[in-house]
């Protein structure tokens, strides 16, 4: 069975084809090759003789037991080698020779028992080494690591490491500029020798499900003393054994680390007193809780020095009391409990993401809701009912505003966005908005992107609501049940590049409303009911137009519409997916491609 | 279409069939077997995925006695620092995991429940597997 040609001459997918050898019928130019789940079993010298351009090679689950010297020799362009799930028993010292550009080596679940004997010391370009899910017992980083000066990610998770000693990390002292992220999760740790991490700098350290008791956690964290880490991730996994007890003493040792960003990811335990618990983390710049349950929500008004707070997928009794002077970014997403938003006091806040919480807002939005006048980014998407009762007073700095899939009330009663002259991006898609007021977008003089799909208009008519949006480049009006539009609806949009009118109820096409769109490149009218043109004589679309989508409409392929069908043929170079432009009527021509019709007035005779 | 039996409990019988062409082997055990009136137990899964599990989600299509409920999307793996350790599993890596579950107080009417589970993962998104579970529910059976 042949391999699947994904990208001709470049990418070949040969997964699970029962190959016992490397195929010899693929082009020399192949760059990406997936041979996974084939019983190759043995890789001899120069196994990839015929693949000089190879950049990505996937050999997952190929039952490989032996890799000989020079198996990958001359693959000088190879950047990614994946060996996941191979029961390697014999790995020659020169197994990886010739890989002078290798950046990513994945040897997950390959029976690797030690880093010491892993012959990769010459791979100077290596950036990522993943040896998770193996049998490694010692965390001693061999001397050859001093050659791996580009290493950025080392994944040792799911191994058998129990202890870390001072000597294990000696090589890292010789590499002070290393930007290394280290994942040690799911190793059954019970001892970290104090001083082992002294004066070590890491970009990221992840320790999840490493400790089987509170005491072990406490002493191991104390063993991290002296570590300087940009990002520290602690926590557990839902489907692994969890700590029976967790209290403030667990994290006391963090006072002896220098941490820029901290994250606690999943804890099967109720956090009550977070002030005491995170006492050593009051001055990290970024603090993050993922999938934890928080009892006392008042604690977030303590004088923490965080600049970025992230609360994701957490459970709260009610919406937390947030009073944080220095906070610039707040991400509060996909949380449960506390369905009603309550005011926060965050005077330095510039970025606020409150998406996917099912929150309702009694009044939105003004400075008093968020306690800041510095807000530039506000995401309230995928929430409940949001009642627009204020026109963003004090929030004039806003540049990005997203309400998609929330239920907006009172949107058409006044110019809600009047003060947002700096706004660049607005998404009110699927917000149950019914446009009944022409001044709905007044004030948005800087707006470049407007997404309002899935809403509706009074009498299914698009009026002149865009007159002030002179900088608009992207407009999405799909799924709005539109049937007609004002001939001057788009007259002021001379910068518009993309216009999506798909999934509406237009029965005819008219070029007149688009005559002022001098920058228009993409016009999508797919999934309407277009049968014919509005006027007998259709003019040309703007000369800038490059893509016109008229697929899945109801074209009437009859003689009376001959000029329209001819006009469509004349637009051929603009049309996309022409094979999906089919006649709907008359019945004998139903399903025929519009462009293949021979349009003469013999058509219906 | 071969039917794979999972387990029987006092009020339910659970089995599944594949609803995809690939039919890559997956082993599913529930202990103790689910009782629909209330249940607490462990779901054990053994599986070798044909793609990375990063950004795994399920599309669930549930039918109750021929009535179709709206499609439900359940995100399992968001993509970073996920709740489940198997979210970091790579294509070809053995997934051998036990997940605890519990629910109570749901009143199910007697009948046949079908649930098509479409597992989607990776970037670009592709189907990982598709299983159609059938639960025959007899509330008062012993």
């Amino acid at each position: 069975e042949p391999c699947v040609e994904v990208v001709p001459n470049i990418t070949y997918q040969c997964m699970e084809l029962n190959f016992y050898k490397i195929p010899d019928n693929l082009p020399f130019s192949t760059k990406n090759l997936d041979l996974s789940f084939n019983p190759l079993r043995h890789l001899g010298s120069y196994s990839f003789f015929s693949f000089p351009e190879l950049q990505v090679l996937d050999l997952s689950r190929c039952e490989i037991q032996t890799i000989e010297d020079g198996a990958y020799q001359s693959l000088s362009h190879l950047s990614t080698l994946i060996l996941t799930g191979n029961p390697i028993q014999s790995l020659a010292l020169g197994a990886f020779s010739g890989l002078s550009s290798l950046q990513k080596l994945v040897a997950v679940e390959t029976n690797l028992a030690s880093l010491e004997n892993f012959p990769i010391g010459h791979l100077k370009t290596l950036k990522e080494l993943n040896v998770a899910h193996n049998l490694i017992q010692s965390f001693k980083l061999p001397e050859y690591f001093s050659n791996l000066t580009n290493l950025e990610h080392l994944d040792l998770s799911s191994n058998k490491i129990q202890s870390i000693y001072c000597t294990d990390l000696r090589v890292l002292h010789q590499m002070p500029l290393l930007n290394l992220s280290l994942d040690l999760s799911l190793n059954p740790m019970n001892f970290i020798q104090p001083g082992a991490f002294k004066e070590i700098r890491l970009h990221k350290l992840t320790l999840r499900n490493n400790f089987d008791s509170l005491n072990v956690m406490k002493t191991c964290i104390q063993g991290l003393a002296g570590l300087e880490v940009h990002r520290l991730v602690l926590g557990e996994f839902r489907n692994e054994g969890n700590l029976e007890k967790f209290d403030k003493s667990a994290l006391e040792g963090l006072c002896n680390l220098t941490i820029e960003e901290f994250r606690l990811a999943y804890l099967d335990y109720y956090l009550d007193d977070i002030i005491d618990l995170f006492n050593c983390l009051t001055n990290v710049s970024s603090f993050s809780l993922v999938s934890v349950t928080i009892e006392r929500v008042k604690d977030f008004s303590y004088n923490f020095g965080w600049q970025h707070l992230e609360l994701v997928n957490c459970k709260f009794g009610q919406f937390p009391t947030l009073k944080l002077k220095s906070l610039k970014r707040l991400t509060f997403t996909s949380n449960k409990g506390g369905n009603a938003f309550s005011e926060v006091d965050l005077p330095s806040l510039e970025f606020l993401d409150l998406s996917r919480n099912g929150l309702s807002f009694k009044g939105c939005c003004s400075q008093s809701d968020f306690g800041t006048t510095s807000l530039k980014y506000l995401d309230l998407s995928f929430n409940g009912v949001i009642t627009m009762s204020s026109n963003f007073l004090g929030l004039e700095q806003l540049e990005h505003l997203d309400f998609q899939h929330s239920n907006l009330k009172q949107m058409s009663e006044f110019s809600v966005f009047l003060s947002l002259r700096n706004l660049i991006y607005l998404d009110i898609s699927h917000t149950h908005t019914r446009v009944a007021f022409n001044g709905i977008f007044n004030g948005l003089s800087s707006l470049e992107v407007l997404k309002m799909a899935g809403n509706s208009f009074q009498e299914n008519f698009l009026p002149d609501i865009f007159t002030e949006l002179r900088n608009l480049t992207f407009l999405d009006l799909s799924q709005c049940q539109l049937e007609q539009l004002s001939p001057t609806a788009f007259n002021s949009l001379s910068s518009l590049q993309v216009l999506n009118m798909s999934h509406n109820n237009f029965f005819s096409l008219d070029t007149f409303p688009y005559k002022c769109l001098n920058s228009l490149q993409v016009l999508d009218y797919s999934l309407n009911h277009i049968m014919t043109s509005k006027k007998q004589e259709l003019q040309h679309f703007p000369s800038s137009l490059a893509f016109l989508n008229l697929t899945q409409n109801d074209f009437a392929c009859t003689c009376e519409h001959q000029s329209f069908l001819q006009w469509i043929k004349d637009q051929r170079q603009l049309l996309v997916e022409v094979e999906r432009m089919e006649c709907a009527t008359p019945s004998d021509k139903q399903g025929m491609p519009v462009l293949s019709l021979n349009i003469t007035c013999q058509m219906n005779k | 279409q071969k039917q794979y039996w999972v387990c029987n409990s006092s009020d339910a019988s659970i089995s599944y069939t594949y609803c995809d062409k690939m039919q890559y082997p997956i082993s599913i055990n529930v202990n103790p077997c689910i009782e629909l009136k209330r249940s607490k137990g462990l779901l054990h899964i053994f599986y070798i995925p044909r793609r990375d599990l990063k950004q795994l989600y399920f599309n669930l299509y549930i039918t109750v006695n021929t009535m179709n409920l709206p499609k439900r999307k359940e995100v399992i793996c968001r993509g970073s620092d996920d709740d489940y350790s198997f979210c970091r599993a790579l294509k070809g890596e053995t997934v051998n995991t036990t997940i605890s579950f519990s629910f109570k107080g749901i009143k199910f009417s007697k009948g046949k429940y079908k649930c098509v589970v479409e597992a989607i993962s990776g970037s670009p998104e592709e189907m990982l597997f598709c299983l159609e579970f059938v639960i025959l529910h007899q509330p008062n059976s012993n």
């Epitope: 050898k21 010899d24 020399f28 001899g44 010298s45 120069y46 003789f49 015929s50 | -």
Partner: nanobody
Framework: EVQLVESGGGLVQPGGSLRLSCAAS????????MGWFRQAPGKEREHVAL????????YYADSVKGRFTISRDNAENTVYLQMNSLRPEDTAVYYC??????????WGQGTQVTVSS
């Protein structure tokens, strides 16, 4: 078993030309691809040019494109490498290699090419 014998190497001035030959004998029916590789002192062996026996498709390394030409003579079971516009950086031992359908690779003993004024 396949035997490969190279010839044609030597000393040449920059800008000059050489033609290398590689004669194959033995189980030549099993060969799927043949090619020329080179190895400079202290460097890894690298691809220069490849040719597919079945359909004659060809590959050249970027560094030799437009200067070197690989060809084959099926009747003589020989593969050639015509090297024009030679540069000092082309100095290396040139090896002929043959890959069989079973992914086994055979090598010649190598021929020295030196480009120097």
């Amino acid at each position: 078993e396949v035997q490969l014998v190279e010839s044609g190497g030597g000393l040449v001035q920059p800008g000059g030309s050489l033609r290398l030959s590689c004669a194959a004998s033995g189980s030549i029916f099993s060969i799927s691809d043949m090619g020329w590789f080179r190895q400079a002192p202290g460097k890894e062996r690298e691809h220069v040019a490849l040719i597919r026996i079945k359909d004659g498709s060809i590959y050249y390394a970027d560094s030799v494109k437009g200067r070197f030409t690989i060809s084959r003579d099926n009747a003589e079971n020989t593969v050639y490498l015509q090297m024009n516009s030679l540069r000092p950086e082309d100095t290396a031992v040139y090896y002929c290699g043959a890959k069989t359908g079973t992914s086994f690779v055979y090598w010649g003993q190598g021929t020295q090419v030196t480009v120097s004024s």
